[in-house]
Interface confidence: low
């Protein structure tokens, strides 16, 4: 009996995703079945299906499939998110480049190479031909898009629209055209499903025809998403499992993008004096390991075989024998001359934070005087006199020109958050440096001498909209969305600005993200009056260790009744011990009664000596961190959502005092939750919202 | 669930070394605090070291410069590497791992059988 192909690979999936169709005229075909690989089987061969299958759904709870003519980039049609479903769309239909000769091109470009506008292939005016839908099932004649149903050499074509030219090849790029990857693609997160000897790829979240480690829950970081090729584990480039069962892997043919810039997420801080993290930026020109043993040159296969080679690892820059770290090893190494010793660890490069000297700055950073001119994101500062008049629009008082030279890494402005400098990019006009405090220094950030306590409220009355004190509505709280689901918490604190964590945002593309706000139910039933969608332009990320993102929305908020910034608490600030608090949350446990309404659990602030002893001595609470607890001991959780607000209230005036994040627990019985301290953040909130340009409404 | 399984145990002569692994099946990225607890006959449990998600690090006066604690979240796994051992660091180990929910207030604590560490001449 011939073994049936496994045609899922030929998907890409969006888990957690399902369709709806908002246009009634669409058709859906529903059946019982036990795998998605039984619908993918079924969708592929438009087997009983009374239309061309596009994408289908499978329903794990019901075991069922629903198959669908279209997919989410069709008119009429919406996504949804589903905890039981998962949507699989052919991405022969998503498409936007071509395998081969482009046989199985699908997508929608309608427009000949040289720019003529195709003519239908259901129609024979202005040119006869034989190229009928009918006459051509499975080749998807549809509209006018370009196909090439016969496989010939040309690619995709059309009869064009122009009589005088009957037919045309369209410009479609080839996918191996399209796809680039910087360096060894270790970032590469492309649509290459692929080898380079033309092999389909193997579903990372399959383990037939080849078992492997490699499952997407193990490694959320290594985008093993359907089929695609990936790096994962430091090889030369990107490879992936293939369906040959007689072939376990194979690379797959992407090539280096011209333009060879990483991502500057993905650059590794260039060093040459000493070690940061650890050491895949280091390119300094130490060439033994620890011992003294002279390294072997990287072009060199004597003494020892290896494929470390600078042809294999082009960013890393392996020049000569220098000490390198090209494969995410513990600190840089090298293969050694010795034949008896294949590699070693050239140990006795220092470490950047255990340098002496200006490799890191005391206190506040203000009398830093090193040479380093980067921004933590890579950036390279701009000249200080070129933005004194930015400058002066922030801070009060003469800055120390003596102390402003160059394009350094300065603080000027008394920021607590240490040394920083302005960029030139209009996106980011300023950003802090990478460079950490002195080990052992304890010197506080927040000096406070004038006031030793200073309230957090503002000496301002609570302010009233439409004779509704704005405290007794929680029109701040807003919903994050990601790819059309809740995912977390946030405070509006500007009309344009949300803060919330750092955690929140698993994806870089911001068109996955939405901010909804007015409302009270967290799927927005019931609150379509009150609700503004806004799409998110720009995150900030905060100082290093904050885990507070600033989220700049694509334009303002439009404040009334439903919708209302929330305060910041005085920078420095101390909320005296007991005071009571609230944090917020739509809490969404995933349970099928969940009410899906805003929930509220009060607190009390704790004292962070008091609160590490309730955390068993595991945490030792800073500065930057704010405790509160259950008001009775025993009362359960607080139901918020990562990024949600610990909202206390002073003088009459409520105020975002902490943000939740990830990994500190709240409101356990005994186990206060820890929260971000807004108030040691707030001068950088207020930098950012006078600094960032946002859209005027 | 997340079980912990502690090895490395035994016996060692006082300024000997030991390393103690805890494997945790199931994935410890969505751990946040794991960590090392002992207890000695008729004594209290206490915490040796603890390490969070970030890297960040937490020890017991009495092994500060003897023991390091690190985590492999590839291989799921935290390490005590105890250098220097004395009579009085004869206890149970046990490892423990702290899993917080999906939202703030939901948090397991998990605990591993112990593993026997003997310093004596």
């Known amino acids: 009996q011939r073994k049936r192909r496994n045609t899922i690979h030929e998907f890409k999936k969006s888990a957690k995703t399902t369709l709806i169709k908002i246009d009634p005229a669409l058709k859906i075909k529903t059946k019982k079945v036990n795998t998605a690989d039984q619908c993918a089987n079924r969708c592929t061969r438009n087997k009983g299906l009374p239309f061309t299958c596009k994408a289908f759904v499978f329903d794990k709870a019901r075991k069922q499939c629903l198959w669908f003519p279209f997919n989410s980039m069709s008119s009429g049609v919406k996504k949804e998110f589903g905890h039981e479903f998962d949507l699989y769309e052919n991405k022969d239909y998503i498409r936007n480049c071509i395998i081969g000769k482009g046989r199985s091109y699908k997508g929608t470009v309608s427009i000949t190479k040289s720019g003529i506008k195709c003519q239908p292939w259901s129609s024979m005016i202005p040119h006869e031909h034989s190229f009928l839908p009918s006459s051509y099932r499975g080749k998807d004649l549809q509209e006018n898009y370009c196909r090439n149903p016969r496989g010939e050499e040309g690619g995709p074509w059309c009869f064009t629209s122009n009589p005088e030219v009957r037919y045309e090849v369209c410009d479609i790029p080839q996918c191996s055209e399209v796809e680039c990857m910087t360096c060894n693609g270790e970032s590469y997160r492309g649509l290459m499903d692929h080898t380079e000897s033309g092999k389909i790829c193997q579903r990372w979240d399959h383990q037939t025809p080849h078992r492997h480690k490699f499952l997407p829950e193990r490694y959320p970081d290594k985008g093993f998403d359907d089929n695609y090729c990936r790096n994962p584990d430091g090889q030369p480039r990107p490879w992936c499992y293939t369906l040959d069962p007689h072939t376990r892997w194979e690379y797959c043919a992407i090539k280096t993008c011209a333009d060879n810039t990483m991502n500057d997420t993905d650059v590794p801080l260039e060093t040459t004096e000493c070690i940061q993290g650890q050491g895949e930026g280091y390119r300094g020109t130490v060439n033994t390991i620890w011992n003294g043993i002279p390294c072997q040159r990287w072009d060199s296969q004597y003494p020892h075989e290896h494929d470390m080679t600078p042809e294999n690892f082009k960013c890393k820059d392996l020049r000569e024998n220098y000490c390198r770290n090209p494969d995410g090893s513990e600190s840089p190494w090298c293969f050694t001359t010795d034949p008896n010793i294949r590699v070693g660890y050239c140990s006795q490069i220092p470490n950047c934070d255990m340098s002496h000297g200006q490799d890191c700055y005391r206190g506040n950073g203000k009398n830093y005087m090193g040479n380093l001119s980067q921004t933590r994101s890579g950036l390279t500062c701009s000249m200080w006199d070129k933005n004194m008049e930015d400058l002066h629009r922030h801070i009060f008082w003469e800055p120390d020109a003596s102390k402003l030279n160059e394009n350094y890494c300065r603080n000027p402005d008394d920021d607590a958050h240490g040394p920083w400098c302005y960029t030139g990019n209009p996106l980011i006009p300023w950003d802090y440096c990478p460079i950490s405090r002195c080990e052992g220094d304890t010197t506080p950030t927040i000096v406070n001498l004038d006031h030793p306590v200073i309230s957090c409220a503002k000496t301002k009355q609570l302010r009233v909209v439409n004779g509704i004190p704005t405290r007794t509505n929680i029109g701040w709280m807003v919903s994050l969305r990601y790819r059309n689901k809740h995912i977390c918490g946030g405070s509006l604190i500007k009309e344009s600005w949300v803060l919330t964590a750092r955690q929140c945002f698993p994806s870089r593309d911001l068109k996955d993200y939405e901010a909804w706000l007015g409302i009270h139910d967290v799927h927005g039933r019931g609150d379509e009056k009150c609700k503004q969608v806004l799409n998110v332009s720009q995150l900030v990320y905060g100082p290093e260790g904050s885990d507070l993102v600033l989220m700049k929305l694509a334009r303002p908020a439009v404040l009334d009744d439903f919708v209302s910034t929330i305060d910041l608490p005085n920078y420095g600030c101390t909320i005296p011990e007991k005071t009571s608090c609230s944090v917020y949350g739509w809490g969404y446990t995933g349970l099928i009664n969940y009410d899906g309404l805003l929930r509220v659990a009060h607190l009390y602030i704790m004292g962070n000596e008091k609160c590490s002893q309730h955390h068993r001595g595991k945490v030792t609470l800073n500065e930057s961190e704010i405790c509160a607890g259950a008001e009775k001991i025993g009362s359960g959780p607080c139901e918020g959502d990562y990024g949600g607000p610990l909202v206390c209230e002073q003088h009459k005036m409520r105020m975002v005092l902490g943000v939740i994040v990830p990994g500190r627990g709240c409101a356990i019985p005994n186990r206060p939750g820890i929260f971000v301290r807004v108030a040691y953040y707030a001068k950088w909130i207020h930098k950012i919202i006078l600094t960032y340009k946002v859209p005027q409404s | 669930e997340v079980q912990l399984v502690e090895s490395g145990g035994g016996l060692v002569q006082p300024g000997g070394s030991l390393r103690l692994s805890c494997a945790a099946s199931?994935?410890?990225?969505?751990?946040?605090?794991m960590g090392w607890y002992r207890q000695a006959p008729g004594k209290q449990r206490e915490l040796v070291a603890v390490?969070?998600?970030?890297?960040?690090?937490n020890y017991a006066d009495s092994v500060k410069g003897r023991f390091t604690i690190s985590r492999d979240n590839a291989k799921n796994t935290v390490y005590l590497q105890m250098n220097s051992l004395k009579p009085e660091d004869t206890a149970v180990y046990y490892c423990?791992?702290?899993?917080?929910?999906?939202?703030?207030?939901?948090?397991?604590?998990?605990w591993g059988q112990g593993t026997q560490v003997t310093v004596s001449s």
């Open positions: 423990n791992a702290d899993e917080w929910g999906d939202y703030p207030g939901q948090v397991y604590d998990y």
């Open positions: 199931g994935s410890i990225l969505g751990i946040n605090a």
């Open positions: 390490i969070n998600s970030g890297g960040s690090t």
